[in-house]
């Protein structure tokens, strides 16, 4: 089952006993499967397995990527998984830990060229569930090494949103990924109704900015399901 496959998952942020933001869980930590944290006058424990569901890599942490944890069961459930270290197998850049990228199915260091010239890389994107198959459309492109030490401006090639400057996200453009602006109020956005449908977009949009959510435009409520227009709107 999904639970048993992932019980070794990294311990996620821990809950404070009485709500509010979780800071440090306290110094006392129990052995697995529980974590001790202060709860009133006594310590309570929390199961250390906290799967974090996602649809895009950007929803996960910088040290994680979004994928289906098992090839067979629990189809459609994608969660944040720990990134893969150097020399581990990969299918796309986001699977590799920061400072690495995916080349020929292996995570390699992005500084191995000492930032000279350009890094040639293969971007493998598959349509549908690009997490569970090695099949896909491959296209060779060049990736400026500058992106690894300066935040990418709009139009810069990127691997993940953390490569882009503030107000930009890393989104698919043809078979590459570039920095695009985070969407503003009133701009058209994409609502993923079908699991994994973001894998079909070759011109991917960023997500809506702070305080906005992607909702059906008021005057489009009567339109047919397929032609509904979604825009970024205030909560």
């Amino acid at each position: 089952t999904l639970n048993s496959v992932l019980n070794s998952n990294a311990i996620k942020n821990l809950p404070p006993p009485l709500g509010g933001a979780a800071g440090h869980p306290g110094s006392a930590v129990s052995a697995a499967p529980g974590i001790l944290y202060p709860g009133g006058n006594k310590y309570q424990t929390i199961d250390n397995y906290q799967p974090y569901p996602c649809a895009e890599d950007e929803e996960c942490g910088t040290d994680e990527y979004c994928a289906s944890p098992t090839r067979g069961g629990d189809a459609g459930v994608q969660i944040c998984l720990a990134c893969r270290k150097r020399r581990k197998r990969c299918m796309r850049h986001a699977m590799c830990c920061p400072g690495n990228y995916c080349k020929n199915g292996i995570c390699v260091s992005s500084d191995q060229n000492h930032f000279r010239g350009e890094i040639e890389e293969t971007i493998t994107e598959s349509f549908g569930n690009d997490h569970s198959t090695l099949d896909g459309y491959s296209r060779r492109t060049t990736l400026s090494s500058k992106m690894y030490h300066t935040k990418g401006q709009e139009g810069s090639v990127c691997l993940r949103s953390s490569d882009c400057a503030s107000g930009l996200c890393c989104a698919r453009h043809f078979w590459s990924k570039i920095c695009k602006p985070v969407l503003k109020e009133g701009q058209v956005c994409t609502k993923h109704r079908r699991k994994g449908s973001h894998g079909l977009e070759i011109f991917q949009r960023c997500y809506c900015g702070e305080g906005l959510s992607c909702r059906i435009q008021k005057d489009h409520h009567q339109a047919s399901n397929s032609s509904r227009l979604h825009t970024c709107q205030r909560h």
Epitope: S162, G167, R194, K195
Partner: nanobody, 125 residues
Framework: EVQLVESGGGLVQAGGSLRLSCVVS????????MGWFRQAPGKLREIVAA????????YYADSVKGRFTISRDDAKKTVYLQMNSLKSEDTAVYYC??????????????????WGQGTQVTVSS
């Protein structure tokens, strides 16, 4: 100040249904994943269900699959847990949790950083 307020808990007979709600208020951040956890007396707090930012990826614990349904309404900053075919072993305090992030913020590891106080669910047999 950020607050998560759960409601909808109570006493129900085995086989019955309850719908829990959790409203997030205060704070100017984007709500990413939202989840429900529970803790029975003398046991560890465990995850029940969680839903991704877009709602397209949903996780359920094996023990509640086919009986519980999680959903979210971003306009209302609310997450719901519809619980059907309740069993005595579902008796616990249910907590909602969310991942709230400032614009452009991305932690090293995604997790639930805001938690509610909990609502008691008691299933009598």
């Amino acid at each position: 100040e950020v607050q998560l307020v759960e409601s909808g808990g109570g006493l129900v007979q085995a086989g019955g249904s309850l719908r829990l709600s959790c409203v997030v208020s205060g704070g100017t951040f984007n709500v990413y994943a939202m989840g429900w956890f529970r803790q029975a007396p003398g046991k560890l707090r465990e995850i029940v269900a969680a839903i991704s930012r877009t709602g397209s990826s949903i996780y359920y614990a094996d023990s509640v699959k086919g009986r519980f349904t999680i959903s979210r309404d971003d306009a209302k900053k609310t997450v719901y847990l519809q619980m059907n075919s309740l069993k005595s072993e579902d008796t616990a305090v249910y907590y909602c949790a969310v991942d709230g992030r400032a614009n452009g913020e991305r932690p090293a590891v995604a997790g639930y950083n805001y938690w509610g106080q909990g609502t008691q669910v008691t299933v009598s047999s």
